[in-house]
């Protein structure tokens, strides 16, 4: 399979302002936690009470003093607690403590990499034995399919035009036309109307034959609340031992519940020195790979999850640290899964993206 060699840093991932970024427009991003507009009436038209006032409602939790960065000035609608219902205020109706405000979404919402708009379930466990994910809570998850529509590998959206996957997923054919990607899906079949199906225009295999590859899409994905890229790590970053990360996929569930729906599992990273011990993977794991899994077994990535993401939460976003690669069986005791260490390939990835 031809290595169209070369490398990449995403074109600024049409990543729209962080939902936490204060917005003075009279519209909001996401749940409006960063809304700083001047609407001051509730959905019923009732004027809002000043955040600093104690009439008609006494309160002490959401005041300008207790939340100095929440924009609680005057009586403007705000969302200091990140309520899923959006901006709200205490009302001037003595019989109604609070109500929501009618703040529209900004016309072109922008979504930052690694920040799902649906909070993940965060299931402690693995995909074999993990749990069904909340729909669209892992919005960078890609289903890599044959041109006839059969799912055979996972992938990760890293920019509107680029998907990262495992090189071994592309062994069957060197032709981009053999593949297509599905974005924004939760069900493996019966695809929902918002799902994006995009052809692949080019394949790039990592030149030193590591199990990582890039797919260039024939047209850019539309970034929506259901389709958001994952963030790339800093070059050569090493995920700390025992960091809890998440794997996702539609792969083989070995009889556990949830086949056909996107599953997730939480796994600790195991440092290579430990993973390479005799009783575990006995020296098979390279420095360009990382291990993750419960040594007791029971949770793991499996066939069909290959090429998919292992993401780790850092500060306020999910970062793509691994590409599902190989394992000795699935979810076996003392046999953690092995993932390509993405940070070792960021320079290559960014180069390919930049030059193509």
């Amino acid at each position: 399979s031809g290595t169209e060699a070369s490398v990449v840093a995403p074109p600024p991932v049409v990543l729209l302002p962080d939902v936490e970024t204060p917005s003075e427009e009279d519209c909001m991003f996401g749940n409006g936690k960063g809304y700083r507009g001047k609407r001051a009436t509730t959905v019923t038209g009732t004027p809002c009470q000043d955040w600093a006032a104690q009439e008609p409602h006494r309160h002490s939790i959401f005041t300008p003093e207790t939340n100095p960065r929440a924009g609680l000035e005057k009586n403007y609608c705000r969302n200091p607690d990140g309520d899923v219902g959006g901006p709200w205020c205490y009302t001037t109706n003595p019989r109604k403590l609070y109500d929501y405000c009618d703040v529209p979404q900004c016309a072109a919402p922008s979504f930052d990499c690694g920040k799902p708009q649906v909070e993940p379930k965060k299931c402690p466990g693995r995909v074999v034995g993990g749990c069904v994910a909340h729909p669209h809570s892992w919005p960078w998850q890609v289903s890599l399919r044959t041109r006839f529509g059969m799912h055979f590998c996972g992938g990760t959206l890293i920019s509107p035009e680029w998907v990262l996957t495992a090189a071994h997923c592309l062994e069957k054919s060197p032709r981009p036309s053999s593949y297509k990607v599905i974005l924004g899906a939760h069900q493996e079949v019966n695809l929902e109307p918002h799902v994006q199906e995009i052809e692949v225009s080019r394949l790039f295999l990592e030149p030193t034959r590591k199990d990582i590859a890039l797919l260039k899409l024939s047209s850019p994905a539309v970034i929506t609340d259901k389709v958001i890229p994952a963030c790339l790590p800093s070059p050569n970053y090493v995920v700390a031992d025992r960091t809890e990360c998440f794997i996702t996929g539609w792969g083989e569930t070995q009889g556990t519940f949830g086949a056909g729906l996107l599953k997730e599992a939480q796994l600790p990273v195991i440092e290579n020195k430990v993973c390479n011990r005799y009783e575990f993977l006995n020296g098979r794991v390279q420095s360009t790979e990382l291990c993750a899994g419960h040594l007791a077994g029971g949770t793991d990535s499996c066939q069909g999850d290959s090429g998919g993401p292992l993401v780790c939460f850092e500060k306020d976003k999910y970062i793509l640290q691994g590409v599902t690669s190989w394992g000795l069986g699935c979810a076996r005791p003392n046999k953690p899964g092995v993932y390509v260490r993405v940070s070792r390939f960021v320079t290559w990835i960014e180069g390919v993206m930049r030059n193509n």
Partner: antibody, heavy 124, light 107 residues
Framework: AVTLDESGGGLQTPGRALSLVCKAS????????MHWVRQAPGKGLEFVAG????????RYGAAVKGRVTISRDNGQSIVRLQLDNLRAEDTGTYYC?????????????????WGHGTEVIVSS | QAALTQPSSVSANPGETVEITCSGG?????YGWYQQKSPGSAPVTLI????NRPSNIPSRFSGSKSGSTATLTITGVQGEDEAVYFC??????????FGAGTTLTVL
């Protein structure tokens, strides 16, 4: 075994603030979301608040929103509930509850373990 | 959020199968079932996330969901199952609610 021990209840004065603490043991506290649910005398269950495993997401029930805050300390395995400006209708038993998952979502559907509860009486 | 609807009471003879339904949560909602033996005593989780049963719960309790209705099934009711059963429902964009409770009487 999972153990959730609530404290901080008792007789409370209207208009004052209530602070409840739940001490957890028997599981990896930092991997799971935690919730507070209350039950007024002779009534059903009511969701009060929830917080995800790392404290970055919170959710609040409609009846207490604007008067409540939930927080957690993963080092000490405790979750706290502060309820402001107490009213007579806040009287009831407050239960600390563990989610089966790490996300703050869906307390009424995802709770897999409960504390014994602490009784709160708001009266002058 | 609209209230959940569950029957106020059901009764059964020992050994019979009982189904308690809960509706009103929406097609994308998740459901849980909780048993309370007496007022003020701590609830016990029977089912969470539609179908999952905690390891300490007998297998005669099972949960299912079809559309926006969840069902708790007790196969082979026993005298000790006499209690109030609450359903709870939520989805990823709401805080969620509980039903008013169903009293199960074992005849």
């Amino acid at each position: 075994a999972v153990t959730l021990d609530e404290s901080g209840g008792g007789l409370q004065t209207p208009g004052r603030a209530l602070s409840l603490v739940c001490k957890a043991s028997g599981f990896t506290f930092s991997s799971y979301a935690m919730h507070w649910v209350r039950q007024a005398p002779g009534k059903g269950l009511e969701f009060v608040a929830g917080i995800d495993n790392i404290g970055s997401y919170t959710r609040y029930g409609a009846a207490v929103k604007g008067r409540v805050t939930i927080s957690r300390d993963n080092g000490q395995s405790i979750v706290r509930l502060q309820l402001d400006n107490l009213r007579a209708e806040d009287t009831g038993t407050y239960y600390c509850a563990k989610s089966a998952y790490g996300g703050s979502c869906c307390g009424p559907a995802y709770i897999d373990a409960w504390g014994h509860g602490t009784e709160v009486i708001v009266s002058s | 959020q609209a209230a959940l609807t569950q029957p106020s009471s059901v009764s059964a003879n020992p050994g019979e199968t009982v189904e308690i339904t809960c509706s009103g949560g929406g097609r994308s909602s998740y459901y849980g079932w909780y048993q309370q033996k007496s007022p003020g005593s701590a609830p016990v989780t029977l089912i969470y996330d539609n179908t999952n049963r905690p390891s300490n719960i007998p297998s005669r309790f099972s949960g299912s969901k079809s559309g926006s209705t969840a069902t708790l099934t007790i196969t082979g009711v026993q005298g000790e199952d006499e209690a109030v059963y609450f359903c709870g429902s939520a989805d990823s964009s709401t805080t969620g609610i509980f039903g008013a409770g169903t009293t199960l009487t074992v005849l």
